[in-house]
Structure formats: C-alpha cells, structure tokens
C-alpha cells in the first residue's frame, strides 16, 4: 500500500492557497469533487464540493473556498483566499464515486498559516482583505458528507500547490456577490 504523503505549504495571513489536484481525465471528469480537512482521529470534514455532476470550469464558492473543475485538463483547482491562522491543517481533494468510497487525490496538503507582514508594497499589517461577501451555495442534497480512510494500492495522481503572485487577481465568472480585489502576498 502506498503511504499517504503530504506536501507542506507555509503562507502568511491574507494570502491565497492555490492547489491543483490532478485526476484521470476519462474516468473522473464529471464526477463530483470535494475539498476536505483532516484532523487526527476524526472523520475528514467536507468543507466544499462541486456540483453533481461536476460542471466544467464552473466556480463553486463556500465561504473563502473556491473550487473549479477543469475537465479538459483533468484537474480540480482549489483556492482558499484571505487565509487565517486557524486555516492551518491537513487537507485533501477527493472524488465522489457512489456507492464506492471516495477516491482520494494525492498529495495531501499540509497548510501552515502564520501571522506576519508579507512585505508586499502597497499592503500593510493592519489592512483587512474582505475578499468576498458570499451567500451559502452548497446544500445537503448536493454535497455528499463523508469520506473514510482507505488503502491505496497504486501510485496516485499528484497534487500541486502554489501561491498567487502579488499582482494576481481573483477573477471568477458567474459567481454572485463577489468583490474582486487584488490578493497581495
């Protein structure tokens, strides 16, 4: 069995985590996908998920989490904007495939968010970035609830993560009540 591996990402408060989870295109393109946090000894907690079936390049927002599923590229893009220290933790992308157990995409992301000035011109420590005013978008009927530990028998797809550049802008379409602001890192 393949060991569950982690990639560590250290970011400052206010920055954006940008994760790309690769999946097998032909098999999972339209499958529903989710972003979960994993805490020791607990069931993984589903924080946000795509629609069922998953729509191509259609942003889904829940709070500060934005999911976009790019069918053509076989990747789920997950962004957590305006990071807070309490966002620190272990995360994973999963693909729902009822009635079978969810399929976990690897590597897991170990996110460490620290306080502190990121040193970007034009930003300051006291500034707050109210990136979104978002109505709730997920419902119980749309999003499956759990995943569970499972044995991995083959080398899984790898996830990659990066931080947005200082002049990047969160530029989403078809999303209600978005206030677009630059995210300084």
């Amino acid at each position: 069995a393949t060991k569950l591996t982690e990639e560590k990402y250290e970011l400052k408060e206010g920055q954006t985590l940008d994760v790309k989870c690769d999946y097998t295109l032909e098999k999972f393109a339209s499958s529903q996908k989710a972003w979960q946090i994993i805490r020791d000894g607990e069931m993984p907690k589903t924080l946000a998920c795509t629609e069922r079936p998953s729509k191509n390049s259609h942003p889904v927002q829940v709070g500060r989490i934005i999911l976009e599923d790019y069918h053509d590229h076989g990747l789920l893009r997950v962004r957590m904007v305006n990071l807070q220290v309490e966002d620190s933790g272990l995360y994973q992308c999963v693909i729902y495939q009822p009635p079978k157990e969810p399929h976990m995409l690897f590597d897991r992301i170990r996110l460490v968010v620290t306080k502190g000035f990121s040193g970007t011109p034009g930003s300051n420590e006291n500034s707050t970035q109210n990136v979104y005013k978002i109505p709730p978008t997920t419902t119980k009927a749309l999003c499956p609830l759990y995943t569970s530990p499972r044995t991995v028998t083959q080398a899984p797809p790898k996830s990659t993560a990066d931080v947005s550049t200082p002049d990047s802008e969160i530029n989403l379409t078809n999303v209600t009540d978005i206030i677009r602001v630059p995210v300084f890192n």
Partner: antibody, heavy 121, light 113 residues
C-alpha cells in the same frame, strides 16, 4: 422513507457486555454519503454520543468510552451493532441509533425510536 | 472536549409568544474557511427520540416549521420559536460537531405558561 430500529436485551448484568443492533430499512447502509452512529441518554438526563461507523468499517469513538466500545457493520443485513463491555449501573440508558451526517451538515438527521437498557443484577 | 452550556434550564412561555433558548460553546465551532458553524439543534418530546431542527446553526431541516429559527456564530447561539404552539412543548438540545467527541448541551425544557 429511511427508518432505523434498535434491538437487543433490555437487561444486562453488571460487568457483562451490552449488545445492540440497529436495522436500517428504506435505504442502504452502504451509502457513501453517511456514517451511522450510536447515542445514549440516561433516564432524565442529556444525550451522549458514543461513536459512529462507515459502511466500510471505519469507526470513530467517544474517547470517554473508547476502551469499552466496539461498533461494527454488516452490510449484507443492512445493520450495524454496538457492544459495550464491563457495564455498570451508570450505563443504564436509552440507546439510540442514528444516521450521522455530522461531518458535513453538523447533524444526526434520522433517529431510531431508542431501546431502554437497564444494568442490574 | 467542547462543553456546551444551555440556558435557561427551563422556560415557560404563553401560547403564541416567543421562546428563546441560548447555547454557549467552550470554544468556537465556526470554520471560517467555509463560514459554517458546526452546531445543530434538536427537539425531544417525552418518550420520543430527538428530532433534528437546525443544522449549520441556522439552516432549517426539511419539514421543520418556519417558526423555528437558529442564529449565532462562534461560541454563542440561539434557538428561537417565534410563536409557541402547544406541540412545541419539549426539551431542546444543542450539539456541536466541530471537534470530536460530538457533545450536547444539557437541554432546555419548554413548557406552556
């Protein structure tokens, strides 16, 4: 409509093992969307979560009871079970089984009617 | 463990009047990343199992009358029955599912004045 029904002995002697089964009807216990849980309520008191299980067998227990609790699942019978060992009078309670969607919605959304278990010699 | 404290222990309200039940958690149950509070409210009538009323602190479960509403965030939550009906006589519990183990409040008994 999903229904849950607890069954098992209503009287257990101290130091013995309490065994209960929950039968799920109107839906599949093998749903990938849910866990299945046990909760208890001593007479005239509040609710205590005992633990939950996924159809694949993954279990999660309340640390206060973990050393004495075993929850198992039998998907072929659409049932899950609770065993609580070394019982004392303090384990006297109504035991409920429930569908556990707590990780996503924060809730136990379908409950059985409950079964009263008395621990006495 | 997160300790859930409900107040008052009991409440007597006239028919048609507002009933308010409070629940306080010993630590925040809000996931700020998805802006959801992992708190639920249940109603338990004598001899019956609990019934889910509210999840995510403020979302009514399907089929629950709209006189029941939940509010609050972080550590302080409220269940409000806007116009008490005779069938609302019950014990009400809050529950957190933010951290294991799931824990419940001690309950609030609602009666008719």
């Amino acid at each position: 409509q999903l229904q849950l029904q607890e069954s098992g002995p209503g009287l257990v002697k101290p130091s013995e093992t309490l065994s209960l089964t929950c039968t799920v009807s109107g839906g599949s216990i093998s749903s990938s969307d849910y866990y299945w849980g046990w909760i208890r309520q001593p007479p005239g008191k509040g609710l205590e979560w005992i633990g939950s299980i996924y159809y694949s067998g993954s279990t999660y227990y309340n640390p206060s009871l973990k050393s004495r609790v075993t929850i198992s699942v039998d998907t072929s019978k659409n049932q899950f079970s609770l065993k609580l060992s070394s019982v004392t009078a303090a384990d006297t309670a109504v035991y409920y089984c429930a569908r556990d969607s707590g990780q996503y919605t924060g809730s136990l959304d379908v409950w059985g009617q409950g079964t009263m278990v008395t621990v006495s010699s | 463990d997160i300790v859930m404290t409900q107040s008052p222990d009991s409440l007597a309200v006239s028919l048609g009047e507002r009933a308010t039940i409070n629940c306080k958690s010993s630590q925040s149950v809000l996931y700020s990343s998805n802006n959801k509070n992992y708190l639920a409210w249940y109603q338990q009538k004598p001899g019956q199992p609990p019934k889910l009323l509210i999840y995510w602190a403020s979302t009514r479960e399907s089929g629950v009358p709209d006189r029941f509403s939940g509010s609050g965030s972080g550590t302080d939550f409220t269940l409000t029955i806007s116009s008490l009906q005779a069938e609302d006589v019950a014990v009400y519990y809050c529950q957190q599912v933010y951290l294991f183990p799931w824990t419940f409040g001690g309950g609030t008994k609602v009666e008719i004045k």
